[in-house]
């Protein structure tokens, strides 16, 4: 069940970040995180596509990794609230 939940969350994580045109920072964060980007030095926002961790998101910057986890945690909270709300609404019918 936990694996399924993680799968749903990761999918939602990518979709939501794609849709957040206002959240330019988040979008670039995930663009770099998932797809990597060309060239670039350490002070630069660009970074090489290389390292993989357990949920399939790429990043070479530890702070960026922490930001990704924070976004994912926020989405988990939002999705969790929505799910609880849906269950509540079903119960009312």
């Amino acid at each position: 069940r936990r694996d399924v939940a993680h799968g749903i969350l990761n999918e939602a994580y990518r979709k939501v970040l794609d849709q957040l045109s206002a959240g330019k920072h988040l979008q670039s964060l995930v663009a770099r995180g998932v797809g990597g980007s060309l060239g670039g030095g350490a002070g630069d926002d660009a970074e090489p596509l290389s390292k993989r961790h357990s949920d399939g998101i790429f990043t070479d910057s530890y702070s960026r990794y922490r930001k990704q986890m924070a976004v994912k945690k926020y989405l988990a909270a939002v999705l969790g609230k929505r799910y609880k709300q849906r269950v509540k609404n079903k119960g009312r019918r």
């Epitope: 357990s54 990043t59 702070s63």
Partner: antibody
Framework: EVQLVQSGAEVKKPGSSVKVSCKAS????????MHWVRQAPGQGLEWMGL????????RYAQKFQGRVTITADESTSTAYMELSSLRSEDTAVYYC??????????WGQGTLVTVSS | DIVMTQSPDSLAVSLGERATINCKSS???????????LNWLQQKPGQPPKRLIY???TRESGVPDRFSGSGSGTDFTLTISSLQAEDVAVYYC?????????FGGGTKVEIK
């Protein structure tokens, strides 16, 4: 104040595995970045990897990829580091450490792992 | 990986004198979030390391103000302005900007 208490010293045979535990108290365990660092006798420090327990998300140093597994049990606020295919060069003190502000603010007391035939 | 080069390997300083340790990284440690994740640790024999400085120059609470960190980009310095007997230890710099996180080789500080 976060406190980290590690399991006791281990003596292992080459080719075997070791699993070291690190129990955290005084913080929200699932929301901590738990790292593992080792130090061979008289040598410097070497980062092995990390786990973010809330998602069981791990990141390993390339050097240890495929040989190290970091896990966490949220119910007991305990992280584990398992190192397989042990060799004599793995004889070291293994530390768990917790990130705060992007650096290791809290350290366990260390666990000595001796690999000897 | 980022290579962290510390110098000198060891340092003997008289009590009350200044001790300076240098640390050089093979790549800039300035992150895109504007922070520089360069840290200094102190390790005494038989003890785990202890955080002294993070973000290149921010002193850990409880650390005496004789310890200071400076530098940016690739060049960093830890200064002990007036060495005390209890400062005898090995000091490590390490970077937390880029994976894999990497450490300097350490500098042993002794009393002359």
């Amino acid at each position: 104040e976060v406190q980290l208490v590690q399991s006791g010293a281990e003596v292992k045979k080459p080719g075997s595995s070791v699993k070291v535990s690190c129990k955290a108290s005084g913080g929200t365990f699932s929301d901590l970045y738990m790292h593992w660092v080792r130090q061979a006798p008289g040598q410097g420090l070497e980062w092995m990897g990390l786990i973010y327990p809330i998602f069981a998300d791990t990141r390993y140093a390339q050097k240890f990829q495929g040989r190290v597994t970091i896990t966490a049990d949220e119910s007991t606020s305990t992280a584990y580091m398992e190192l397989s295919s042990l060799r004599s060069e793995d004889t070291a003190v293994y530390y768990c450490a917790i990130d705060q502000d992007g650096s290791f603010a809290y350290w366990g007391q260390g666990t000595l792992v001796t690999v000897s035939s | 990986d980022i290579v962290m080069t510390q110098s000198p390997d060891s340092l003997a300083v008289s009590l009350g004198e200044r001790a300076t340790i240098n640390c050089k990284s093979s790549q800039s440690l300035l992150d895109s979030d504007g922070k520089t994740y360069l840290n200094w640790l102190q390790q005494k024999p038989g003890q785990p390391p202890k955080r002294l400085i993070y973000w290149a120059s921010t002193r850990e609470s409880g650390v005496p103000d004789r310890f200071s960190g400076s530098g940016s980009g690739t060049d960093f310095t830890l200064t002990i302005s007036s060495l005390q007997a209890e400062d005898v230890a090995v000091y490590y710099c390490w970077q937390g900007t880029w994976f894999d996180l990497t450490f300097g080789g350490g500098t042993k500080v002794e009393i002359k």
